[in-house]
């Protein structure tokens, strides 16, 4: 008789998940000499231990603590780039501006980026068929709790001027329900963080509006100011030119507004 299996609304665990996590860990530790002490097998065992045999709607931050401990990493606290709904450009930026870091430039963020995973209560199996959807099923699922945990720790570590890249093409440029809006904003430490500087990325070629005046940006400014952190905002009208000028700052066209 086949065992009854819970059908969730979201996609199942990414295929070859264990091998992918192990491979990413090995690659990361090869590239980053400061992380060579990390034992990737132990990292995988801790990662797996966070969700295997547990109900995928009953995962806690505590479940991920052994993994967090193994993945402890020091990044320059004044070189942190947060992002919301514009991951690709943020990653392109830190690939050029090598001294700045997104969460996905850290070991733990790199391991889990774009992956899905979950287990089943009381079995050691990984569920490759379906996993809980944050909206339709439950918020305390393995993937959401992981990102909430690492995002909180990343924001807590930030200091001085923290940058955030926001998508100016979205109806809500700042979304209170995003990971940035619900987790990172509230975990910046006012004793350490002087300023949050938002970079609003424009989508249209002819879009010359000042998106820093957008009501959702004003809402972000209000939240940040109430936390005794200064706020500043810049329009990035030409993201392609912006990246080009990060690569080649001496270029004569890079003195004008981008």
């Amino acid at each position: 008789v086949p065992r009854w299996r819970q059908q969730w609304s979201g996609p199942g665990t990414t295929k070859r998940f264990p091998e992918t996590v192990l491979a990413r860990c090995v690659k990361y530790t090869e590239i980053h000499p400061e992380m060579r002490h990390v034992d990737c097998q132990s990292v995988w065992d801790a990662f797996k231990g966070a969700f295997i045999s547990k109900h995928p709607c009953n995962i806690t931050e505590e479940d991920y603590q052994p993994l967090m401990k193994l993945g402890t990493q020091t990044v320059p606290c004044n070189k942190i780039l947060l992002w919301s709904r514009i991951k690709d450009l943020a990653h392109q930026f830190t690939q050029v501006q090598r001294d700045m870091f997104t969460l996905e430039d850290t070991l733990l963020g790199y391991l889990a980026d774009d992956l899905t995973w979950c287990g089943e209560f009381n079995t050691s199996k990984i569920n490759y068929q379906s996993c809980p959807d944050w909206r339709k099923d439950c918020s305390n699922n393995p993937v959401s709790v992981f990102w909430k945990t690492v995002s909180r720790r990343f924001a807590e570590a930030a200091c001085d001027v923290v940058h955030v890249m926001l998508n100016g093409s979205r109806s809500k440029i700042f979304d209170k329900n995003s990971t940035f809006g619900s987790v990172e904003v509230h975990n910046l430490q006012p004793e350490k963080v002087q300023t949050l500087e938002a970079w609003v990325i424009h989508g249209g070629r002819e879009d010359s509006r000042d998106l820093c005046q957008d009501p959702t940006i004003k809402e972000l400014e209000s939240i940040i100011s109430k936390r005794n952190i200064q706020f500043s905002c810049k329009n990035i009208y030409r993201p392609d030119k912006f990246l080009q000028c990060v690569k080649n700052p001496e270029d004569s066209s890079c003195t004008s507004e981008i």
């Epitope: 091998e19 192990l22 002490h37 034992d39 990737c40 097998q41 132990s42």
Partner: nanobody, 122 residues
Amino acid sequence: EVQLLESGGGLVQPGGSLRLSCAASGFIFSVYAMSWVRQAPGKGLEWVSGISGSGGSTHYADSVQGRFTISRDNSKNTLDLQMNSLRADDTAVYYCASGKGWDGNTWYEDYRGQGTLVTVSS
């Protein structure tokens, strides 16, 4: 270029001991898990034992548990397998392998050496 060179194989009587060694080069040894894999005559490959990059985690096949001990020296880029209480069914070509690690009984291999023959016979 990755190179894995096994040594220490030979003929040994049942109940005897043997120590296999593997010299690794061409990659950052300490970040890779290492394993011993064997192939008995006319049989498929069997994952014998694995050790994590730092040496903190080890894994043994049920068939060798308590008899074989895997170890590594990251300062010398070497992998060893101490084999005690050898039996006739341990006769095989033993390969040193580097890889990403393992999940349960699945070993994720990248490279494998040429092998060294172990014969257990009276």
